[in-house]
Interface confidence: low
């Protein structure tokens, strides 16, 4: 039969800094020995040589000595290569090309990625901000490839495209540094997110600034609370923020602060003729006293639970009043999959076998993905089934039906869409009769 | 304010060529990616194809690799559509549209009609 | 690729009605996105990543789901609201887009 070199069609994505497997494959004849076999890896563009496989033994690497075949498994017509300490200038095309008596040849690609630091973020001017003033933000991440786009937004999540300048410079080792600078005229308050997102590794670093300007005394109350859910996980304390603007001359006996649920106005926590009345919730609740007179009437809730989710009110009277609400978004890690397989042994190519993802105790609902060894979606005979317990916790049990190949690995990804965490499990199922778990 | 004019649509016979411009203004053309969408007679709309905001990435519909080439020339803020091979199913009205993050398509132009036929 | 049923295709609402619409993914979607489209017009950006209001929508629209099942709602229908809808997916290339929904006054 004909010789058939078979390479991934996808690039290989490696980080810098890791080691990278090219993958190889050619199919032997039977009685085939690596003393017929000669194996050249080089570079697809230069043909510069990598690494050969001649005589019946490794030639070794022609490439900065970072490369390695894979000797055990040539005889089976693995003719993968390894490339160590992937750098920057190591991306691009590697053709591997297999010679016995008919030959043959693919090329893989290699794509290098660095994942960008979180930005940091800088403001000029910083101080003795007015609604009005030009003020110019610097967004800067670091040591990442390829090149990042970047993205602004305002608290809103409504993209700020005008006046954006972004520049990018390449370090010795081929990483990019980004600053992108945002000039924007204050409102009356505003948080500016900036979001460095790396292309290949799909990786989205962030980072916002929220930028309070001081304020002409008016006499109104501004009550003042994120325009953004806090995100709190389960079982830990959470911080909703509310602040107003204390006239000169404001005390603490002045205040009438009241907390409540936005939808059925049941009272949280109350502040109320020069005191703290206390915590109406479970008494889970507290204030912050030390800050009240500086005007933050922020509430501390405790140990968080999946039935505080919503939205709750901040209520604030003196001589004027005022209320703004926010929300809680509760949430809580899933755990790592669990991978079972049914049947789940002397597995043969043409079986179908049924896998089963599992993942416990996340919040809210999670998004399940499939996708095989190369990364491609796997969307079809998938059943997907949440359970939430009395916590409100959910257990997530995704289920795969599949015809085996000749091997293949499957994937499973539970994502959460609030936390964006994503917990991954993975079943590699070879072609000849075998048992799953491996026995040893 | 942002304003993406499309232009370049025109008659054209099966089997002919044709290259759609965009030109983009009211925001920083260069940070952002951007796509071309086409509607069909029938109103449905349909992806065409993407370009990251540097140039370096760029995503096609299998239906269209080969035959369409999506381009950028950030110094004139200008995005393009190079397309061969058209065929009947190709008429439609061609959108421009800035893409956020890959993820929605905030602005659109006017779009620009392409017919193909004999 | 991920298929999205738009429903339904047609449907007509009084003003001060309350409207909603559906899209349904053929697999589950990270996101949904939703666009309104006037006879003459080019589509314009209602609701990006399934729940946000974008930039000079009105406070009636609103979006929610999750998975492979999403709904675009008018809390109160008014003149202006008559266009036809489309929903777009994000979770995997191609990037797809729903049939429509068409929506007339009564």
């Known amino acids: 039969g004909a010789l058939e070199v078979q390479v991934p069609e996808d690039p290989v994505v490696a980080l810098v800094g890791t080691d990278a497997t090219l993958c190889c494959s050619f199919s032997p004849e039977p009685g085939f020995s690596l003393a017929q076999l000669n194996l050249i890896w080089q570079l697809t563009d230069t043909k510069q040589l990598v690494h050969s496989f001649a005589e019946g033994q490794d030639q070794g690497s022609a490439y900065a000595n970072r490369t390695a075949l894979f000797p055990d498994l040539l005889a089976q017509g693995n003719a993968s290569l390894r490339l160590q300490r992937v750098r920057v200038a190591d991306e691009g095309s590697f053709t591997c090309f297999v010679s016995i008596r008919d030959f043959g040849s693919a090329a893989v690609s290699l794509q290098v990625a660095a994942p960008y630091s979180k930005p940091s973020m800088t403001l000029e001017p910083n101080k003795d901000l007015r609604p009005g003033d030009t003020v110019t933000i610097t967004c800067s991440s670091y040591q990442g490839y390829p090149e990042a786009e970047v993205f602004w937004q305002d608290g809103q999540g409504v993209p700020l495209t005008g006046n954006v300048t972004t520049s990018q410079m390449a370090n010795e080792q081929g990483l990019f540094d980004v600053h992108s600078i945002l000039r924007v005229v204050l409102g009356a308050n505003g948080t500016y997110s900036c979001l460095v997102r790396n292309p290949v590794l799909q990786q989205d670093a962030h980072s916002s600034v929220t930028i309070t300007p001081q304020r002409s005394p008016t006499g109104a109350v501004e009550v003042q609370v994120p325009e953004d859910p806090v995100v709190a996980l389960v079982g830990t304390d959470a911080t909703l923020r509310c602040s107003f603007s204390p006239e000169p001359g404001f005390s603490l006996a002045q205040l009438n602060l009241i907390w409540q649920l936005t939808d059925t106005k049941q009272l949280v926590h109350s502040f109320t003729e020069g005191r703290d009345q206390g915590s109406a919730y479970a008494n889970r609740t507290a204030l912050f006293p030390d800050l009240l007179a500086q005007g933050n009437a922020s509430l501390r809730l405790q140990r968080v639970r999946v039935a505080d989710e919503g939205s709750f009110t901040c209520f604030v009277s003196i001589r004027d009043f005022g209320s703004a609400a926010v929300s809680l978004q509760v949430a809580a890690p899933y755990s790592k999959p669990s991978m079972t397989l049914e049947p789940n042994k002397d597995l043969r190519p043409g079986d179908t076998v049924t896998i089963t993802c599992s993942s416990y105790r996340g919040y809210p609902e999670a998004e399940v993905f499939w996708q095989d060894g190369q990364g491609v979606p796997l969307t079809g005979n998938v059943t997907t089934s949440q359970m939430a317990n009395e916590q409100g916790l959910f257990d997530v049990h995704s289920v795969l039906r599949v015809v085996l190949g000749a091997n293949g690995t499957y994937s499973c990804l539970v994502r959460n869409p609030v936390l964006q965490q994503d917990a991954h499990g993975s079943v590699t199922i070879t072609g000849q009769p075998m048992t799953f778990p491996p026995e040893a | 304010e942002v304003q993406l004019v499309e232009s370049g649509g025109d008659l054209v016979k099966p089997g002919g060529s044709l290259k759609l411009s965009c030109a983009a203004s009211?925001?920083?053309?260069?940070?952002?990616?951007m796509s071309w969408v086409r509607q069909t007679p029938d109103k449905r709309l349909e992806w065409v194809a993407t370009i990251s905001s540097g140039g370096s990435y760029i995503y096609y519909p299998d239906s269209m690799k080969g035959r369409f080439t999506i381009s950028r020339d950030n110094a004139k803020n200008t995005l393009y559509l190079q397309m061969s091979s058209l065929q009947s199913e190709d008429t439609a009205i061609y959108y421009c549209?800035?893409?956020?993050?890959?993820?929605?398509?905030?602005?659109w132009g006017q779009g620009t009609t392409l017919t193909v036929s004999s | 690729q991920i298929v999205l049923t738009q429903s339904p295709a047609i449907m007509s609402a009084s003003p001060g009605e309350k409207v909603t619409m559906t899209c349904s993914a053929s697999s589950s979607v990270i996101y949904m996105s939703w666009y309104k489209q006037k006879p003459g017009s080019s589509p314009r950006l209602l609701i990006y990543d399934t729940s946000n209001l974008a930039s000079g929508v009105p406070v009636r629209f609103s979006g929610s789901g999750s998975g492979t099942s999403y709904s675009l709602t008018i809390s109160r229908m008014e003149a202006e609201d008559a266009a036809t809808y489309y929903c777009q997916q994000w979770s995997s290339y191609p990037r797809t887009f729903g049939g429509g929904t068409k929506l007339e006054i009564k």
């Open positions: 009211g925001f920083t053309f260069s940070s952002y990616g």
């Open positions: 549209a800035s893409d956020y993050g890959s993820r929605y398509f905030d602005y």
